[in-house]
Interface confidence: medium
């Protein structure tokens, strides 16, 4: 049976185990793996790999026995190992691969494990003695029996029959994402000094996650995905977002070399050596990694992370996974393969894509050439120097290339003629008995942001023209108005004359024609992604961020944009979070993106907001956000009560207590207050972060978010013995803004 790093099987155990004869045969490449747990409230038997050694822990009553294999013998070598553990007549014996490894006396008491047997992982079992146990098994259990009974039947859908090929796949075997919920998790991607992620991607997915690494601070992450057929990278750090697009299409079923590079100063994504990067000004700072590096898909937590984020990451997009494959994966320069994965879902070893799906189109010789953006610019110098054959006319002495190339300069969104000076011959054509019409150009790779337009019948489709057409101004480059300041065309130049000349001219030489784009300042304008109406609850505040309004300026970075709030500054409801009560009449795009601004409603009709945004040269037309303040309505969603044993504690969760408000897209603070004294216990709240080990302490009130984060509980403290169940009536009131709902 194959376990993929997050799966387990459960086997019920009706009675206490007096004798134990456990036989397991497993194989894994992971140094950590939970193999088997027999679980009771206190009694338990645990078999796990830890640092490649097998550890056995048996707890019977007050007694604890530990056995382990020697440090020299690592069992995480992908080879099947047979483990036999027997506990008979007060004696425990452990042997691995037929050799006796350890034995010890044990108490004669039976093993009380009413919670059952857990094979390969512990599931959702949350027992104190499970702290610090190994990760779930990623590997194979070829056999598992207890007292002659198989523990591998019945298999669940997540635990597969047989031993999956992926567990023995070497680094050079591709990661195949077969979908629809494929995912591979690897050890965290650290980017302290710098981080690199490299792989060759083959897919036809136009929308798919590629890589996700969460950060230590809540809300931080690095995310790389395919968005509308192109690569996109997002880094959320602190409160700022860095967003980067690459313009090379990747969803074409062809292999593409992808590289993501991040350091404290910049983020770069490169496809087929074609890079896009942020400016050096944007300081990203170190993202402390938390959890695993997810490739090809997202788990529930990562999906939630991205859906909470203000990018338009739709649930469909975050739930989808990559259909395709990644080859030659390397993380920070270290090769990674399926064997190193901590967890996989719906993965295949190797790149088994439907052949017909990825068949190349066979273009006819004179049919249109692809004008996709560059996939891989040849690494050699272009054109390749030509070595003329002996016996050619003297005009070809010292000949290496036909043309001298000069950059074509075009205004952003403008047009420019391709002229003689851009493609000037290096030799006298007349002396070489060549005519301009015999020098044939074909566009083998189009520019990313523009089109070479040919005013010649039939030539536009073929993307072919002659030097004579250039002289006659028949070829012009039309720029599409995008912001990149450089581009290039790849031209193949051949000569069709039947005169003596170097054979390389008949075959054709490849030239890169650089295109220099002179930028034009576009005025910014304001957009309201969710419409120009905002609803706020009376006497509350609502964050103003890019989800409410944002600036669109194709040629200015966020750093260069400033918003102004028009109208009188007195009583202006826009404020900075850290400067309450002080109107923010002007703020930067960075502040908006960082979530530093709030709309504060202090009563009366809400004030509409009219903004304009400026890039320092030009300002946008004013845009108005209509604001409507509505009275908070509080409705009890759940109030179920708790049942618990005297002296114990029980969390109060949203399933027990929650209210709903009429807030629209607003995360309002909901405060519960205890309005009466408690007789038999106390209400407690956990300290910040809700981390394990944070202190619980008594409280008289709490917020709904505390309940959602599992940070509120009721502790029974009554020491008296009662002959009946005592009932604690918890009287609460709820406050939202200035609205209070009593007698909850």
């Amino acid at each position: 049976a194959s376990f993929f790093g997050e799966n387990h099987l459960e086997v019920p155990v009706a009675t206490a185990l007096t004798d134990i004869d456990l036989q397991l045969q497993f194989s894994t490449s992971q140094p950590e793996a939970l193999l088997l747990l027999a679980a009771g409230p206190a009694d338990h038997l645990l078999l796990q790999l830890y640092s490649g050694r097998l550890q056995v822990r048996l707890v019977l009553g007050q007694e604890e026995l530990r056995l382990q294999t020697p440090a020299e013998t690592l069992l995480s070598d992908s080879i099947p190992h047979t483990v036999v553990l027997t506990v008979v007549e007060g004696w425990a014996t452990l042997s691995v691969d037929g050799f006796l490894n350890a034995s010890s006396a044990v108490p004669g008491a039976p093993l009380e494990v009413p919670y059952g047997l857990f094979v390969g992982g512990t599931g959702t079992l949350g027992l104190p003695y499970l702290r610090g146990t190994s990760r779930p098994l990623r590997g194979c259990l070829h056999a598992a029996t207890l007292n002659g009974r198989s523990l591998l039947r019945p298999l669940t859908p997540d635990v597969h029959e047989g031993c999956a090929e992926e567990f023995s796949a070497s680094d050079d075997v591709a990661l195949g994402f077969s979908g629809p919920h494929s995912l591979a998790a690897f050890p965290a991607w650290g980017t302290q000094d710098e981080g690199t992620l490299e792989f060759t991607l083959t897919t036809q997915s136009r929308q798919a996650p590629l890589a996700f690494q969460a950060g230590g601070r809540r809300g931080d992450f690095i995310y790389v995905d395919i968005f509308e057929g192109h690569l996109r990278a997002v880094v959320e750090k602190g409160q700022g977002t860095v967003l980067l697009h690459n313009s090379v299409p990747v969803a074409d079923g062809q292999p593409h070399e992808v590289s993501v590079h991040i350091n404290a100063h910049r983020l770069e994504i490169s496809v087929d050596q074609y890079p896009t990067h942020t400016s050096n000004r944007g300081v990203l700072s170190y993202l402390e990694p938390r959890g695993s590096l997810l490739l090809g898909g997202l788990d529930a937590e990562a999906s939630r992370h991205l859906q909470e984020h203000r990018l338009g990451l739709t649930p469909e997009a975050t739930n989808a996974s990559l259909l395709g494959c990644m080859e030659d994966l390397s993380v920070n320069g270290q090769r990674r393969g399926l064997r190193e994965a901590l967890l996989t879902r719906n993965m295949a070893a190797g790149c088994r894509l439907e052949e017909e799906e990825y068949e190349d189109d066979a273009y006819g010789h004179y049919e249109a050439f692809s004008t996709l953006a560059p996939e891989a610019w040849p690494a050699m110098e272009l054109p390749e120097p030509c070595v003329p054959e002996p016996g050619l006319p003297p005009v070809f002495a010292n000949f290496t290339q036909l043309l001298t190339i000069s950059p074509l300069v075009v205004a952003e969104g403008g047009t420019a003629w391709l002229e003689w000076r851009h493609v000037q011959p290096t030799l006298d054509l007349m002396e070489a008995e060549l005519r301009k019409s015999q020098v044939l150009f074909s566009v083998t790779r189009g520019a990313r942001h523009g089109e070479l337009e040919l005013d010649i019948p039939g030539a536009q489709a073929r993307k072919m023209f002659t030097l004579l057409d250039v002289v006659n101004r028949k070829a012009r480059f039309i720029h599409d108005g995008s912001e990149d300041t450089s581009d290039q065309l790849v031209l193949e130049v051949s000569v069709t004359a039947r005169v003596p000349m170097p054979s390389c001219l008949r075959r054709g030489q490849t030239y890169l024609l650089p295109i220099q784009v002179n930028p034009v300042n576009d005025p910014p304008h304001i957009i309201f992604p969710h419409g120009s109406l905002m609803v706020i609850l009376e006497h509350t505040q609502k964050p103003l961020g890019p989800e409410v309004f944002q600036a669109y300026d194709p040629d200015s970075a966020c750093e260069g944009l400033t918003f102004q709030v028009l109208g009188t500054s007195s009583g202006l409801p826009v404020e900075r979070r850290d400067q309450p009560g002080e109107p923010a009449t002007e703020f930067s795009c960075r502040e908006l993106e960082a979530g530093s601004l709030v709309y504060v409603h202090r009563g009366g009709p809400a004030q509409d907001l009219t903004f304009r945004v400026s890039d320092g040269l030009q300002a946008s037309p004013p845009a108005t956000l209509k604001v409507v303040a509505i009275r908070p309505a509080i409705q009890i969603h759940r109030s179920t009560g708790l049942r618990l044993a005297q002296g114990s504690a029980m969390p109060i969760l949203p399933a027990n207590l929650s209210v709903e408000t009429n807030a629209v897209g607003q995360d309002v603070s909901v405060l519960f207050r205890v309005t009466g004294a408690l007789q038999f216990g106390e209400l407690q709240k956990q300290g910040a972060g809700g981390v394990e080990g944070a202190e619980w302490w008594a409280t008289q009130a709490f917020h709904q978010r505390d309940v959602e984060q599992g940070r509120v509980r009721y502790l029974s403290t009554d020491p008296q013995h009662h002959a009946y169940d005592t009932v604690e009536n918890l009287a609460l009131e709820v406050q939202v803004g200035q609205e209070i709902l009593s007698n909850l």
Partner: antibody, heavy 122, light 107 residues
């Protein structure tokens, strides 16, 4: 009208002892957690001790600086809280306030006594 | 222990002005912060709890904001009776700790 009336305090020599009292009226004393907070020019406001309810087994918490020297106690029948201080030091000098946590969120002090001055000096 | 650093230590203002006091925690305290006002010769009195909720009877010119490590108390339209010292306090973990105080003087 909630009132926390303090008594005790005065001048005491280093190493000496002193007991502060706090009588509460205006609310059901047995439902409130009681605290002592002190204030000095050197250290500002400083929480020193807390006592919980009978149902909380009269749980007590102390600041590290007074642990083992100060004892907080309560007598619900007398609606009173006490702070017994032994082995007093010069740095214990300050105004001592008896305070309570009420029916609001978290551990902050919604009722304060008038304060009583403790001076530790030879 | 969680340290609370208040700034400024002293501030002078006029009636009708708006002033802000900041309180910085040495570690995350969520919104578990209270603010107190102590008038000369009196005991402290609660102003705000849970970082931004006004205590019963506190005028709405007192507002609070912040979460995590940075908190602000703002008094808009300062009145002469606001002459006092202001303290923040965290109740996120024991020991409960206070800021060093900010003395507000009315010109």
């Amino acid at each position: 009208q909630v009132k926390l009336q303090q008594s005790g305090g005065g001048l005491v020599q280093p190493g000496g002892s002193m007991k502060l009292s706090c009588v509460v009226s205006g609310f059901t004393f047995s439902n409130y957690w009681m605290n002592w907070v002190r204030q000095s020019p050197e250290k500002g406001l400083e929480w020193i001790a807390e006592i919980r309810l009978k149902s909380n087994n009269f749980g007590r918490y102390y600041a590290e600086s007074v642990k083992g020297r100060f004892t907080i106690s309560r007598d619900d029948s007398k609606s009173s809280a006490y702070l017994q201080m032994i082995n007093l030091r010069a740095e214990d000098t300050g105004i001592y306030y008896c305070t309570s946590y009420g029916n609001y969120v978290g551990h902050y002090f919604d009722h304060w006594g008038q304060g009583t001055t403790v001076t530790v000096s030879s | 222990d969680i340290e609370l650093t208040q700034s400024p230590k002293f501030m002078s203002t006029s009636v009708g002005d708006r002033v802000s006091v900041t309180c910085k925690a040495s570690q995350n305290v969520d919104t578990n912060v209270a603010w107190y006002q102590q008038k000369p010769g009196q005991s402290p009195e609660p102003l705000l709890f849970s970082a931004s909720y006004r205590y019963t009877g506190v005028p709405d010119r007192f507002t609070g904001s912040g979460s995590g490590t940075d908190f602000t108390l703002t008094i808009s339209n300062v009145q002469s009776e606001d002459l006092a010292e202001y303290f923040c306090q965290q109740y996120n973990s024991y020991p409960l700790t206070f800021g060093g105080g900010t003395k507000l003087e009315i010109k």
